[in-house]
């Protein structure tokens, strides 16, 4: 059918409530494309009725709400004028809620559901609430250890929890709750976070600092080969991974077939006070599809990407 | 480091009660769920039931339903296991085992109390 | 709910033997829901093998766990005899929890 697929390896966890999930590919997206969706390999698209449980909203697949049956790979097909690419993604569901049973809850928990707070200091907890226009979300509620947080130390802002003068107590289970409408009806979202504290006040905190990339552009020629560090200083005694990531997904494993793009050996210097780590990115040849496309170094809960610009055509030359 | 401290052997008499206590320390005992098992003398374990600790939830295997009760006492840290009408086929070493969020296993066992129901 | 079946019952194995004993499931489960704990006589269970094939804290690396579905197997690539002991297998994924009957494994 002459489209490329994209294989998104990283699967979504998912309890049995609303969830959606968006088609983007900068820089495929960003222009005049159609998006359509896809379940298990199905000839027949997603349906577009907003009154179906399962539909297509724009370029958003969106489950009202998500069933056990629900799991498996679903794709989304998008055809520009003269391209079409076929998007992977592996979704598992799991039924049960932490605060009703730890049977059959979520294992082996995605960064999204892990946050840090910074003892002493005030901080925050974001709930990741991603739907499309069409679903309204109404206020948050916040539980801890599945009972719902009160008291002056916490404040409720959008989707956040402000924690103020943060206490070792403070670290545990906790769970953001909303009723999201749309159409009409309601359902609830409850995602689980499991929060720690940490209690380092060494080379700034433990919290990782990513010196290099800046959230910035790169200009590079087309067919080039490129070699960009992530250079991150953290304390002597973490245990943060550094890696590069893109579309949510480890390079090594995004282009596990092609091998155009990869991730280099980490090094490190030490300091007295703390160590550098440098990781690079490898492009072997640089395509296309690379611009555009957020190219993220993580390190721990720190983030930071490059995005590749073809030069701008130097008008001298003419 | 993380510790189940569970009561030492019991003997009982046949149609009494009994209650086993595991105390924890060295986690929050309030974030995590707490279960029972038994396992009775050379054969395999069977799993009782689980509460958790800050909202008292309780989830049990229907066979238990009746027999055991799960509490806790979330000021001494410690989760209790309640054992009514006992008879013989009660007799069993009950152990309770902790689960974290994220981590669906036994991670951490108490040392099991031997329970011995007799005349 | 969910039986899960272990085979075989009772085995022995000599020092440096490689070791295989298996657990089937009734019905299907999850790989991050499937568990193994040694037991040794006198002691209470121990986390051994995590979501299929993750090897507990401590645990040498002699060990491995594989499969998916309902066939799931604890490998010893080179018995010890400190590897004596009591296997159960354990599903996490629905209700009731369930054990194996366990895999008693002798030093020949």
């Known amino acids: 059918d002459g489209c490329k697929d994209i294989f998104m390896k990283n699967e979504i966890l998912s309890a049995s409530q609303p969830f959606a999930f968006n088609c983007t590919f900068p820089p495929i997206t960003s222009g005049e494309v159609s998006v359509t969706w896809y379940k298990n390999s199905s000839k027949i698209p997603v349906s577009k009725i907003i009154q179906s449980r399962i539909h297509q909203d724009e370029t958003w697949i969106l489950f009202l709400p998500m069933e056990w049956g629900d799991s498996g790979v679903y794709q989304c097909v998008i055809k520009g004028r003269d391209s079409c690419h076929r998007i992977h993604v592996n979704l598992t569901v799991f039924e049960k809620h932490w605060c009703d049973t730890s049977i059959g809850g979520l294992p082996n928990l995605s960064d999204e559901y892990k946050q840090i707070l910074h003892l002493g200091k005030d901080d925050s907890l974001t709930c990741h609430l991603h739907f499309p226009k069409s679903c309204v979300l109404g206020p948050i509620k916040w539980y801890k250890d599945c009972n719902e947080i009160k008291g002056e130390r916490f404040t409720v802002l959008e989707t956040r929890l402000l924690v103020s003068n943060v206490s070792a107590e403070d670290r545990g289970n906790y769970a953001c709750q909303a009723i999201l409408t749309h159409s009409g009806k309601q359902y609830e979202v409850l995602n689980g976070i499991t929060v720690s504290i940490t209690e380092r006040a060494g080379y700034g905190g433990s919290v990782p600092k990513i010196i290099y990339p800046k959230n910035h552009s790169i200009e590079v020629q087309l067919g080039t080969t490129l070699i960009v560090d992530c250079n991150v200083t953290d304390t002597k005694d973490n245990t943060n991974l550094r890696c590069w990531r893109v579309n949510n997904t480890l390079v090594d494993d995004y282009y596990d077939e092609s091998k155009r793009i990869r991730e280099g050996v980490e090094t490190h210097v030490s300091f007295r006070e703390h160590n550098l780590y440098t990781v690079n990115i490898t492009f072997l040849e640089v395509k296309m599809e690379d611009y555009g496309l957020p190219f993220m170094c993580h390190a721990g809960v720190s983030t930071a990407y490059i995005i590749l610009q073809l030069p701008a055509p130097d008008f001298r030359a003419y | 480091q993380v510790q189940l401290q569970q009561t030492g052997s019991v003997l009982v008499r046949p149609g009494t009660s009994v209650k086993l206590s595991c105390k924890a320390s060295?986690?929050?005992?309030?974030?995590?769920?707490m279960h029972w098992a038994k396992q009775r003398p050379g054969q395999g374990l069977e799993w009782i039931g689980e509460?958790?600790?800050?909202?008292?939830?309780?989830n049990y295997n229907e066979k238990f339903k009746g027999k055991a009760t799960l509490t806790v006492d979330t000021f001494s840290s410690t989760a209790y296991v309640d054992l009514s009408s006992l008879a013989s086929e009660d007799s069993a070493v009950y152990y309770c085992?902790?689960?974290?969020?994220?981590?669906?296993?036994?991670?951490?066992w108490g040392q099991g109390t031997l329970v011995t129901v007799s005349a | 709910q969910i039986v899960l079946t272990q085979s075989p019952t009772i085995m022995s194995a000599s020092p440096g033997e490689r070791v295989t004993m298996t657990c089937s499931a009734s019905?299907?489960?999850?790989?991050?829901?499937l568990h193994w704990y040694q037991q040794k006589p006198g002691s209470s269970p121990k986390l051994w093998i995590y979501?299929?094939?993750n090897l507990a804290s401590g645990v040498p690396a002699r060990f491995s766990g594989s499969g998916s579905g309902t066939s799931y197997s604890l490998t010893i690539n080179s018995m010890e005899a400190e590897d004596a002991a009591t296997y159960y297998c354990?599903?996490?994924?629905?209700?009731?929890?369930?054990f194996g009957a366990g895999t008693k494994l002798g030093l020949k």
């Open positions: 979501s299929t094939s």
């Open positions: 509460i958790h600790p800050n909202s008292a939830k309780t």
């Open positions: 019905s299907s489960v999850s790989s991050s829901y």
């Open positions: 060295g986690y929050t005992f309030t974030s995590s769920w």
């Open positions: 085992a902790r689960v974290d969020y994220g981590k669906p296993w036994f991670a951490y």
């Open positions: 354990q599903q996490f994924q629905s209700s009731p929890l369930t």
